[in-house]
Amino acid sequence: KWETKNCSVSSTNANDITQSLTGKGNDSEEEMRFQEVFMEHMSNMEKRIQHILDMEANLMDTEHFQNFSMTTDQRFNDILLQLSTLFSSVQGHGNAIDEISKSLISLNTTLLDLQLNIENLNGKIQENTFKQQEEISKLEERVYNVSAEIMAMKEEQVHLEQEIKGEVKVLNNITNDLRLKDWEHSQTLRNITLIQGPPGPPGEKGDRGPTGESGPRGFPGPIGPPGLKGDRGAIGFPGSRGLPGYAGRPGNSGPKGQKGEKGSGNTLTPFTKVRLVGGSGPHEGRVEILHSGQWGTICDDRWEVRVGQVVCRSLGYPGVQAVHKAAHFGQGTGPIWLNEVFCFGRESSIEECKIRQWGTRACSHSEDAGVTCTL
């Protein structure tokens, strides 16, 4: 029932505007005049609705219907005109509030003294507001009763309805603006400082970038003391035995060197960055890889025979007998290093395969991958 809705919205807005304008203790004559004008408009509206009720009996007489409809149209136009006046008045007061907000800064110290008076005034205003709300509720009831009779006239009044809705929408926007001003003023009064929150959690680690170009070979440095034992390289054939070096005192661990070229022998040495855990023998188990100094597992997404083949061959086995999913050899405890690994099957180690991302949060240890290598 559009009439009820429009009147109730207007009533609520009127209440909000009154609160917004009086709730700050700016009891200037201008504001009091605005209240009076507003209440007068509301009173006029009430009288006009009462007039519609009085004319209700005349509706039965079809002879007077058309004349009545035209009169009603005229009355709604009057209401629309009054709403426009009200809108202009509210706009004027919006400008006044802008100026008031500017002067509030300089009045800040004075307002602190007035705070007690404001609280008393607020109490009175709340009483007045409560009374106004009761009156508006009664008015809403009356309007609801009237709206039942007016429903028959809805077709002729569609155009008018749209216009009034538009005006109410504008009024809503103004009210919201006033509410916002009210909030800004209260924030100024409370002197609240907003503190920036802590930074968010770090994003996921980016994909590994492509290998950079090799730089030119540098001049050989002096023979340094031996570093800590590095990771074992990929399967290579042993070269000829070198001459024994001078014994040196142990030094700091040096950076990992580049992978050497294959020698000419035929002995397979396993790639120590991969191990099999939890199987019946060394040829099978949950696949664990050493990365960043920590052993971790591989998620079984896209875990297929070609990947298992690479793992087994890198460990010195001739091939893969089976690949296992869903933590077949038990769940690991370390990080889940890899989610999706893609191999064609002939790569010398799993690191040579296409790895989308190191360190994944998309899997759980219930999806740890395993292999059984052929003996």
Epitope: R208, P210, T211, E213, S214, R302, E304, V305, R306, Q309, G319, V320, F342, C343, F344, G345, R346, E347, E352, C353, K354, I355
Partner: antibody, heavy 121, light 108 residues
Framework: QVQLVQSGAEVKKPGASVKVSCKVS????????IHWVRQVPGKGLEWMGG????????IFAQEFRDRVTLTEDTSPDTAYMELSSLKSEDAAVYYC??????????????WGQGTLVTVSS | DIQMTQSPSSLSASVGDRVTITCRAS??????LNWYQQKPGKAPKLLIY???SLQSGVPSRFSGSGSGTDFTLTISSLQTEDFATYYC??????????FGQGTRLEIK
């Protein structure tokens, strides 16, 4: 050490089909992937299709999508490439090759000896 | 699809010469470029992968460089067995794999 041995030369009529085989040794067929590349005499190399581990399926170059069929027989570890509706432009040497990832990129380090297919009416 | 263009299409040189072949991609392919050598009646042979990594067993006189769209294959001192056709191949887009049209290296 992987080895790829292809079937012998073929002479076909336009509209017919040709089936080239590629026998794998050193690995089983399930342990690696086979791709096919052709070379028209006096021209460059043209990739036809093969298994993509990222997609988990065999994919083809647009030009061959409707005419080429790639199959595998695991008991003799042999891969097959069948090209249908032959045209004179299909006369070429057909190679099977096995890829691997080289620093995340795809490279072909083992090739079959090639099979010459002649299309003549 | 990514187009690969090699230049020159043919080249004459003498034993001992330093030879450079270039390959240009139609869009940036990072360093995902390989070089192959092919001799008449034979299958291609991988020389260099990912722009500059020398394949095992390939003589050190072969070297590769470049990144993005422009790449070069250099033979520092040409030997008799190096006279062949050379192809570049990109694998940036995974599939379709595309090759250059080839550069034929002949004896002067």
């Amino acid at each position: 050490q992987v080895q790829l041995v292809q079937s012998g030369a073929e002479v076909k009529k336009p509209g017919a089909s040709v089936k080239v085989s590629c026998k794998v040794s050193g690995y089983t067929l399930t342990e690696l992937s086979i791709h096919w590349v052709r070379q028209v005499p006096g021209k460059g190399l043209e990739w036809m299709g093969g298994f993509d581990p990222e997609e988990g399926e065999t994919i083809f170059a647009q030009e061959f999508r409707d005419r080429v069929t790639l199959t595998e027989d695991t008991s003799p570890d042999t891969a097959y490439m069948e090209l249908s509706s032959l045209k004179s432009e299909d006369a070429a040497v057909y190679y099977c090759t096995t890829p691997r990832y080289c620093n995340n990129g795809i490279c072909y380090d083992y090739w079959g000896q090639g099979t010459l297919v002649t299309v003549s009416s | 699809d990514i187009q690969m263009t090699q230049s020159p299409s043919s080249l004459s040189a003498s034993v001992g010469d330093r030879v450079t072949i270039t390959c240009r991609a139609s869009q940036s392919i990072s360093n995902y470029l390989n070089w192959y050598q092919q001799k008449p009646g034979k299958a291609p042979k991988l020389l260099i992968y990912t722009a500059s990594s020398l394949q095992s067993g390939v003589p050190s006189r072969f070297s590769g460089s470049g990144s993005g769209t422009d790449f070069t294959l250099t033979i520092s001192s040409l030997q008799t067995e190096d006279f062949a056709t050379y192809y570049c191949q990109q694998s940036y887009s995974n599939f379709p794999i595309t090759f250059g049209q080839g550069t034929r290296l002949e004896i002067k």
